[in-house]
């Protein structure tokens, strides 16, 4: 299984600030896929 | 039956140590973000710790921040969490949760942080 | 971190009375909020989420609206089993919160 998601467990203000200033769903998606693809798939399944 | 046995309360001094213990079962346990939550006497609900699946992400409250650790057994679907260096303002109700891992169809995201299974509570009392 | 303010604090009611309990936030949380029942010596329990969706289980007097900062909890007609204090929680972002929480006792 996999899980994308949008807020975090962990308190990461880097994340927050993007995520406060993406104009579009569709860059929220294209910030999300930036992210699966960097973090390994830290808390997903 | 979805259900959240736990233990490990009681009454310890101000700088010990207490281990809580959260038992999950009628749930595909290691499917799911878990969560301790508190709840001083006679006051509001207060948010402790969130821990993944597969405890890649871990977080903590300001007030706890390396104080407490969360952890979870998958193998044994076991929550715990280990309380070091207890202060009287760490009294509370401890509550474990599951995560709905709620899935927004408009976004095509998950979002943690709804609790849709609660224990039934222990109480952690830090008193000299 | 998204402080969460619930009004009124307690309320008093009759069975069979509407009830509305509103709710706010510091900050823009879109839909990202939860409503939870507790009773006394009880844990929390889940009533509605995502502002207004209802809880599997949860009878239908139960409601919720609102999105942005702004939120309600309605109880279309107040039951015996419904005296209990509520909170809202916000779940948009790290660390969640919930509001002071909203005890409503029988007049």
């Known amino acids: 299984k996999h899980k994308c998601f949008r807020n975090s467990l962990e308190n990461n203000e880097t994340l927050e600030s993007i995520m406060n200033t993406l104009e579009s769903e569709e860059d929220f998606r294209k910030y999300f896929y930036y992210l699966e693809g960097s973090k390994g798939g830290g808390g997903s399944k | 039956e979805v259900q959240l046995v736990q233990s490990g309360g009681g009454l310890v001094q101000p700088g010990r140590s207490l281990r809580l213990s959260c038992a999950a079962s009628g749930f595909t346990f290691d499917d799911y973000a878990m969560h301790w939550v508190r709840q001083a006497p006679g006051k509001g609900l207060e948010w402790v710790s969130g821990?993944?699946?597969?405890?890649?992400?871990?977080g903590y409250a300001d007030s706890v921040k390396g104080r407490f650790t969360s952890s979870r057994d998958n193998a044994k679907n076991s929550l715990y969490l280990q309380m070091n260096s207890l202060r009287a303002e760490d009294t509370a109700l401890y509550y474990c949760a599951k995560d709905m891992e709620y899935y927004d169809i408009l976004t095509g995201y998950y979002s943690y942080y709804i609790m849709d299974v609660w224990g039934q509570g222990t109480t952690v009392t830090v008193s000299s | 971190d998204i402080q969460m303010t619930q009004s009124p604090s307690f309320l008093s009611a009759s069975v069979g009375d509407r009830v509305t309990i509103t709710c706010w936030a510091s900050q823009g949380i879109s839909s990202y909020l939860a409503w939870y029942q507790q009773k006394p010596g009880k844990a929390p329990k889940l009533l509605i989420y995502?502002?207004?969706t209802l809880q599997s289980g949860v009878p239908s007097r139960f409601s919720g609206s609102g999105s942005g900062t702004e939120f309600t909890l309605t109880i279309s007609s107040l039951q015996p089993e419904d005296f209990a204090t509520y909170y809202c929680?916000?779940?948009?972002?790290?660390?969640?919160?919930f509001g002071q929480g909203t005890k409503v006792e029988i007049k």
């Open positions: 929680q916000q779940f948009n972002s790290y660390p969640p919160t």
């Open positions: 821990i993944s699946w597969n405890s890649g992400s871990i």
């Open positions: 995502a502002a207004s």
